[in-house]
Every structure is written in C-alpha cells, then in structure tokens.
C-alpha cells in the first residue's frame, strides 16, 4: 500500500497527463488544457478569477521557455509555488502545527 | 470536498511538518528527519539506499542555501524531482498514457 | 501609456563591450512580462537578442548567447543588456521591447531604439 | 530555428486598394504569428497578434488570416499612413524570428 506522499507524487504526475493528453502535444499542457485543469482540479486556488487576462498572465508566468505550453517540469514548479503558499498559511497558525520544539 | 490535487499538495505540506516538528527550527528539516521521513514517507523512492554516505550526499543536493537544514523550498524542489523521474517512466510506457490526440 | 528608453554608447570598438539600458515608464516593471532586446542591421532584417521576465527567468539567441549578458533592476524600473567582443556585424539599431502576455507573445510596445557603430 | 519568408519583399500600390502579404514559416507555428508596422527612422508598431487578433487601437482596415505554416495580412483598403515596411514575426517558440520585410510603396 503507498504512502500518502507517494500517493501525492503519483496523483501529481496523472493529473498532469488527464489535461494534457486531450489536444496537441501529449505531453504538455496548452492554454486551453491548463485553464480547464485548474478549474476542475484546483478551484480553491483559482477562486473567481477566471478572466481570461488572469489566465493568459498565469500561462505566462508558467511558462519559462516561451513555446506557449506548460511542459511538466513548469507544471512542477506551479504545483511547487501554490505547496509554498499552502506553507505560509500553515506556518503562520502554530496552533495547527506539529508539536513546538 | 478537497479534489485530489489540492489533497495532494495539504499532503506535501503536512508531511514536511510531521517531521521538521522534532529538533531544532520547526520550519526546516535537520538530517535525521530527512532520513525519518524518506524511510517512512517515501520507502518506493529509497529502496534500499539507507547508507549514511547516500544520506549525506542526498542531503547536500537538497540543501542549496548551505545551511545543514532543508527548508520547505528545497523539499517542494526535491519532490518535484521525484515527481519528474516519476514522469519520465510514466511517458516511457504509451499504453499507460491518457488517450492519444 | 507605456514607453521604452534606450541608452548607452552610440560608438563601441572592436573587441569591447557594448553596454545597453532600458529605462521602462508608465508601467510598473512586473512579473507580467518579458523585456527584451531585439536589434535591426543596417538596411536588413530584424534579430530577437533575448529577454528577461518571470522571476528573472532569461533566455537568449543561441546565436548569441556566449557572448550575452542580460540583468535587471526593478527598483530603477530597468533591464540592461552587454555583448561582449563586439565586431563590425553588431552594428544595428538596438530597440528594446516589451513582450505581451497574450497568445504568441507579441512585442507590444518598443522603444524608439539606438544605432550602435562597432567602429575603430 | 524557424526560418520566416515574407513575400513580396516590395510591392507598390495605390490609396485605396486591397493589399495582400504572406508569410511562410519552416515549420508548423500554430497560429503564433504576430505582424508589425515600421515607418523610416522609427519602431515598429504591433498591428496584430496569434494570426488574427487585431492589437489595441490598430483599424480593422488591417486583418490577418491563416494556419499551419502559412499567414497572411490584409489591408482591405489601403490609406496614405499605411505605405510603410511590415514584418511577420513567429512567437512559437524560442529563439524569436522575423520575416525579411514587405515594403509598400506608393505607384
């Protein structure tokens, strides 16, 4: 039986894939697949803000080597930062931290 | 309802906590918690590398800022690592993939 | 409005350094987009230089790339560009532009560009 | 890198008239085509973006069309401030490239 963080990983890798084998190259996420994978897969994070400039500058900002796409190693990074701001929000309510040291 | 990505990202969060709880900065994973939490959290991605040199050397690639401590930051680039290797054999074996475009 | 502003030498010599600087206004310099530089020969086409953006992401012309530096200052509100060992073929106008976050990231807003004369 | 052929290179019109330029990438570019405006001495102004998308305050006298390796602008009728050079330009992917230029010229 896996671990929950090997879960986490495994669920990480296959929700990429769900999105990006739907339109173009397989093995990215274009516009279109990107938006509908945070809509559906991320909606606290995404919030009310489905305008398309939000989503445009968001596909910009992933979007390190320019192609119009969001390959997996960008997806990564995305995942990472929404993981550090989940952090922030954790670590500043130390009641619900693990034990003090 | 939390979608399973979202619950796999509280998982990076909380695990990361589970252990950097322990000793020292409660922010930041000291050694023996790294080496606690890849055996228990990540056994698959270990297997059976549980030699102190392996340790160390894993150690010294995640701490990047160089200061004996892995912080959330340096975690979330070491899982996207792990989720990247996991990617690479994803992507290696076409009948597992979602359906062609 | 957004407006751009090249400056630096108008005459650089052979085998030295040209140093460019962009002065953005109207605009803060945000993560939103990229600043690029992109150069036009004499009486010829026009060459993408390289760009930087996104939490000082930079890409640059494998052409040109070991030759390339590119950096920026977002406190003046300004990205900056240095060539080294420059010879007579790096004489162009320099313009650096603003790239869009829209589809295809188009080159929305330009400055007016400076000539620069590789020249002994 | 994705070589970009413009064509003509020059063409001479008058005020008033339909004006057709291509473009032909190397390779598909999936509709990232954007086109430009350069008047003597000065930058190049963006008129349209992703093929077809007129840019802010462009006129719609100016369209673009096409798919795959193969684009086109269109001025549907041809004014005084239009005669200037215009290049094509891929935003597919990295490093950026340009097409050689179509100037228009007054007959």
């Known amino acids: 039986m896996a671990c929950p963080l090997e879960k986490a990983l495994d669920v990480m890798v296959s929700t990429f894939h769900k999105y990006s084998g739907k339109e173009g190259d397989k093995f990215k996420l274009n516009k279109s697949e990107l938006k509908e994978l945070l809509t559906r897969e991320l909606p606290s994070f995404l919030g009310k803000r489905t305008d398309e400039a939000a989503f445009q500058k968001l596909m910009s900002n992933l979007d390190s080597n320019r192609d119009n796409e969001v390959d997996f190693q960008e997806y990564c990074v995305f995942l990472s930062c929404i993981a550090m701001m989940c952090n922030e929000f954790f670590e500043g309510f130390p009641d619900k931290q693990p034990r003090k040291k | 309802m939390a979608c399973p990505l979202e619950k796999a990202l509280d998982v990076m969060v909380s695990t990361f906590h589970k252990y950097s709880g322990k000793e020292g900065d409660k922010f930041k994973l000291n050694k023996s918690e790294l080496k606690e939490l890849l055996t228990r959290e990540l056994p698959s991605f270990l297997g059976k590398r549980t030699d102190e040199a392996a340790f160390q050397k894993l150690m010294s690639n995640l701490d990047s800022n160089r200061d004996n401590e892995v912080d959330f930051q340096e975690y979330c680039v070491f899982l996207s690592c792990i989720a990247m290797m996991c990617n690479e054999f994803f992507e290696g074996f076409p009948d597992k993939q979602p359906r062609k475009k | 409005q957004v407006q751009l502003q090249e400056s630096g030498p108008g005459l650089v010599k052979p085998s030295q350094t040209l140093s460019l600087t962009c002065t953005v206004s109207?605009?803060?310099?945000?993560?939103?987009?990229?600043w690029n530089w992109i150069r036009q020969h004499p009486g010829s086409g026009l060459e993408w230089i390289g760009h930087?953006?996104?939490?000082?992401?930079?890409n640059y012309n494998p052409s040109l790339k070991n030759r390339l530096s590119m950096s920026r200052d977002t406190s003046k509100n300004q990205f900056s560009l240095k060539l080294s060992s420059v010879t007579a073929a790096d004489t162009a106008v320099y313009y650096c532009?603003?790239?869009?976050?829209?589809?295809?990231?188009?080159?929305?807003?330009w400055g007016q560009g400076t000539l620069v004369t590789v020249s002994s | 890198d994705i070589q970009m052929t413009q064509s003509p290179s020059s063409l001479s019109a008058s005020v008033g008239d339909r004006v057709t330029i291509t473009c032909r990438a190397s390779?598909?570019?999936?509709?990232?085509l954007n086109w430009y405006q350069q008047k003597p001495g000065k930058a190049l102004k963006l008129l349209l973006y992703?093929?077809?998308r007129l840019h802010s305050g462009v006129p719609s006298r100016f369209s673009g069309s096409g798919s795959g390796t193969d684009y086109t602008l269109t001025i549907s009728s041809l004014q005084p401030e239009d005669f200037a050079t215009y290049y094509c330009?891929?935003?597919?992917?990295?490093?950026?490239?340009f097409g050689g230029g179509t100037k228009v010229e007054i007959k």
């Open positions: 532009t603003r790239e869009s976050f829209y589809d295809g990231y188009p080159f929305d807003y």
């Open positions: 109207g605009d803060s310099f945000t993560n939103d987009y990229y």
């Open positions: 930087i953006g996104y939490g000082g992401n930079i």
């Open positions: 390779q598909d570019i999936r509709n990232y």
């Open positions: 992703y093929t077809s």
């Open positions: 330009q891929q935003g597919n992917s990295l490093p950026r490239t």
